[in-house]
């Protein structure tokens, strides 16, 4: 059920997945919504404790029952992810945060006119996830007008502190406002040998690309197809980056495909949700439920309507066996990162993903079309 | 494959599950062997680092491939669990550790003649997991001959420090040497409302009892059967304790069963492994693999032979459908605690557990029979 209300001075007890730092409860909910497993969150507002290092903590939570006990806690703000909600979602966050310093790896600094220009610089830099700008009111005269571009492994600040005279905010790449090159090509028989940030399992290079696009630090990827000679690496999607922002080493290898994140693109195609069905394919993962349904579409809908379901495998009924009742078996599944733990073939399953992330695509497409 | 050799001055890189403290590499391997997911370990011997708080750390590890990269590290000792080995296993550890203080909750102290008597006191106390005894050489005269009985949430010390004049060791309950009452009755229509240490999912009260017996702090349990009115609590096994060591609150409720840990018993029946098959029952969990095999016994054997497999669900082939090939489908599964995440009925599966823990039962039974 969709709960949009937030609960002031309330903390959810238990169910912790991880803690990140966000400048507001609204942004905390955004992070929770896009996290593969988060269903609930507790945000520790400024002055929520005597220890300022605990302020702005956004505690991401999960629960098998989709609910957690509420306890009183001064300064805490709790609520539910929008996974359970029908409305459109966007990763785009245009808000700027006054007198907050969002800490990260400061990899670039320059003098610019105002905070808006600093945000544009961040949006047009491949690595930049968020920025801090020292305004004309910043106490240290030498640092005024300084624009710091930042990134972290997670895409959220490592900590957030109060600091007078600064303004912080996030890159607007996800608002479709980046002016960097958008490379939509997928290159066959190509391995990129740059730094691997992470690896996930994916059924094809398009899903691999979407996962890269959705990942905070992925700039390009290499995908090993089902025909890749090394069995243990089949369906492996390597998420990659480099200092320059471009691949440095391109190697020709059969049955591998490579390409780029679509984070700089104005999307007319889905980049978050994976709507396809994969025939004669089993997605392995942690099982949530088994239900009898008619057809793979109903199975996908059942998965989409279950807030914890990330992907599914559907086994059609054998036609000869039970002509009367043509229901098949629908296995609802999840994993720690939203991707299958393994992909198998030749066992007769039809697999696919929850469509709940499609809500993000449409809004993005809608927002960008007029441009 | 079974690897009994340990690797000196070697650490396994990555794959960390958790860190516990153990007095020796041998005991670390024992903990790893009995942990539901541990396949490899790295033990930090005394003087392995400049920081004595890191000595005696036993880092439990897992790996999808069952191997991890080895790196040089002075004072580290690494090796593999005995899960992969055919030999008998025992949780029984009679060793005592000279000049080591194993830290825990000191809940009872008394003056006794020697370390053996202290170990016997620990063995005959429901809560005691390990002890520290101050010998006649202990620097503080007032504390000499003092026997401290200890427990922790995990059953292993919270830390271990060097301390001259003390001897430490573990309870010998698992050696079948406890003189406390062994209550084998399972009480129908009974709920015990004492402190819950943990809750797991189990197919029946016997498995629930075995899990309680195997758990470091469980003294008794309540199990909600398939007929329990509240659906979300069906098959729930509540692991319990109390200060007195006995249940304080017994409430009559249909479809609940309660009983005691068998940790004080001289076992003539399996208490670690769950050999039964559960018909028309699906065990849900994290999927490892799907293989086509003939019969549920072969499925169980396949699970037992896979070091990471904890339980399975087997779907027999439809007789009418494919008379020629009578293989069914065997789903190999695991979870964080070794128990299914859910149990479902009416879907035609036959489920059961890996038999690798049976190796522990036999040795125990053999050891105890002569008494």
């Amino acid at each position: 059920e969709c709960v949009t209300k937030v609960f002031k001075d309330i903390s959810f007890q238990g169910g912790d997945l991880s803690t990140v730092f966000t400048p507001s409860a609204t942004y905390c909910r955004l992070v929770c919504t896009h996290h593969p497993r988060c269903l609930l969150f507790t945000f520790m507002a400024e002055s929520s404790s005597d220890d300022p290092t605990k302020w702005f903590a956004c505690i991401l939570k999960d629960s098998v029952t989709e609910i957690l006990p509420m306890v009183n806690m001064t300064g805490a703000i709790s609520g539910y992810s929008f996974k359970q909600c029908p409305q459109q979602l966007s990763t785009c966050s245009k808000d700027v945060y006054v007198n907050l310093d969002m800490k990260g790896m400061n990899y670039n600094s320059s003098v610019v006119k105002n905070a808006r220009e600093c945000q544009e610089r961040c949006t047009d830099d491949a690595h930049c996830q968020f920025f801090t700008y020292a305004t004309g009111y910043f106490p240290s005269v030498d640092h005024r007008k300084m624009c710091l571009l930042k990134y972290t492994r997670t895409g959220t600040p490592t900590t957030i502190t109060k600091l007078n005279g600064v303004v912080s905010g996030f890159s607007l790449k996800s608002c479709g406002l980046s002016n960097l090159a958008c490379i939509r090509d997928i290159f066959p028989n190509t391995v990129l040998a740059d730094l691997n940030i992470d690896s996930v399992v994916a059924p094809d290079a398009f899903v691999c690309r979407r996962i890269c696009t959705h990942h905070p630090t992925c700039l390009f990827f290499t995908f090993f197809s089902q025909a890749w000679p090394k069995e243990s690496q089949r369906h492996l999607c390597l998420l990659k980056t480099s200092e320059s922002g471009l691949p440095s080493t391109r190697i020709t290898k059969s049955h591998a495909l490579s390409g780029f994140s679509l984070q700089h693109c104005r999307h007319s195609v889905p980049v978050f949700c994976h709507p396809s069905f994969y025939n004669d394919t089993d997605f392995l993962g942690e099982e949530l439920d088994i239900v009898d349904v008619k057809g793979q579409e109903t199975c996908q809908k059942t998965c989409t309507n279950n807030a914890r379901c990330q992907f599914f495998t559907y086994y059609p009924s054998h036609r000869l066996c039970n002509e009367r009742n043509r229901r098949g078996r629908c296995y609802l599944k999840l994993s720690s990162n939203g991707s299958p733990t393994r992909i198998l073939h030749g066992r007769g399953g039809i697999s696919g993903y929850s469509l709940r992330l499609c809500k993000m695509d449409n809004v993005c497409t809608t927002k960008i079309n007029p441009r | 494959e079974c690897v009994t050799k340990v690797f000196k001055d070697i650490s396994f890189q990555g794959g960390d599950l958790s860190t516990v403290f153990t007095p020796s590499a041998t005991y670390c391997r024992l903990v790893c062997t009995h942990h539901p997911r541990c396949l490899l370990f790295t033990f930090m011997a005394e003087s392995s680092s400049d920081d004595p708080t890191k000595w005696f750390a036993c880092i439990l590890k897992d790996s999808v491939t069952e191997i991890l990269p080895m790196v040089n590290m002075t004072g580290a000792i690494s090796g593999y669990s005995f899960k992969q080995c055919p030999q008998q296993l025992s949780t029984c550890s009679k060793d005592v550790y000279v000049n080591l203080d194993m830290k825990g909750m000191n809940y009872n102290s008394s003056v006794v003649k020697n370390a053996r008597e202290c170990q016997e006191r620990c063995t005959d106390d429901a809560h005691c997991q390990f002890f520290t005894y101050a010998t006649g050489y202990f620097p503080s005269v007032d504390h000499r001959k003092m026997c401290l009985l200890k427990y922790t949430r995990t059953g292993t010390p919270t830390t271990i420090t060097k301390l001259n004049g003390v001897v430490s060791g573990f309870s010998l309950k698992s050696c079948g040497l406890s003189n406390l009452a062994c209550i084998r009755d399972i009480f129908p229509n009974t709920v015990l409302a004492d402190l819950n240490i943990d809750s797991v999912v189990a197919p029946d009260a016997f498995v629930c009892r075995r899990i309680c017996t195997h758990h470091p702090t469980c003294l008794f349990f309540t199990f909600f059967s398939q007929a329990w009115p509240k659906e979300s609590q069906r098959h729930l096994c509540l692991l319990k304790t109390s200060e007195s060591g006995l249940p304080s609150t017994r409430i009559t409720k249909s479809h609940a069963l309660s009983g005691f840990s068998l940790q004080h018993c001289r076992h003539s029946v399996p208490v670690f492994c769950h050999p039964s098959f559960y018909n028309d029952t699906d065990f849900l969990g994290e999927e490892l693999d799907i293989v086509d095999v003939k019969g549920q016994e072969t499925c169980q054997k396949t699970c037992t032979n896979n070091a990471r497999c904890q339980f399975f669900t087997y779907y027999p082939s439809h007789r009418l459908c494919n008379e020629r090939n009578r293989r069914g489908r065997c789903y190999l599964k695991l979870s964080s605690n070794g128990s299914p995440t859910r149990i479902l009925h009416g879907r035609g599966g036959i489920s059961g557990y890996s038999l690798r823990l049976c190796k522990m039962d036999n040795v125990c039974t053999t050891k105890i029979n002569p008494r």
Partner: nanobody, 126 residues
Framework: QVQLQESGGGSVQAGGSLRLSCTAS????????MAWYRQAPGNECELVST???????YYADSVKGRFTISQDNAKNTMYLQMNNLKPEDTAVYYC????????????????????WGQGTQVTVSS
């Protein structure tokens, strides 16, 4: 979101009475086992009284004959009538549903399907 809300706590002299109420939202009492637990500072959470879905009641030895548990299914409310209160009854009292025992000695941790209220303070002075 299931919520259990206690009320009726307060301060009272030894020998006095209080009536605690527990009201549930998004939840019906009919098929649930309801209970009152309490936790005094530095102590474990302890079961005070239970009323099961089939109407059975249980009382801890320390409160037998002084406390009475009841419920009004129409109002979705459970009560604990506490008479002849003693200083040792001082604690935070928690209402719970389908919760057989507390976890970690704390009257808030639940296992699947179990629920706790936020608690109401009862102080009995001599």
């Amino acid at each position: 979101q299931v919520q259990l809300q206690e009320s009726g706590g307060g301060s009272v002299q030894a020998g006095g009475s209080l009536r605690l109420s527990c009201t549930a939202s998004e939840f019906t009492f009919d098929d649930s086992d309801m209970a009152w637990y309490r936790q005094a500072p530095g102590n474990e959470c302890e079961l005070v009284s239970t009323i099961t879905s089939d109407g059975g009641t249980y009382y801890a030895d320390s409160v037998k004959g002084r406390f009475t548990i009841s419920q009004d299914n129409a109002k979705n409310t459970m009560y604990l009538q506490m008479n002849n209160l003693k200083p040792e009854d001082t604690a935070v009292y928690y209402c719970a549903a389908d919760q057989w025992g507390s976890a970690e000695g704390d009257c808030t941790s639940s296992y699947p399907g179990g629920y706790w209220g936020q608690g109401t303070q009862v102080t009995v002075s001599s």
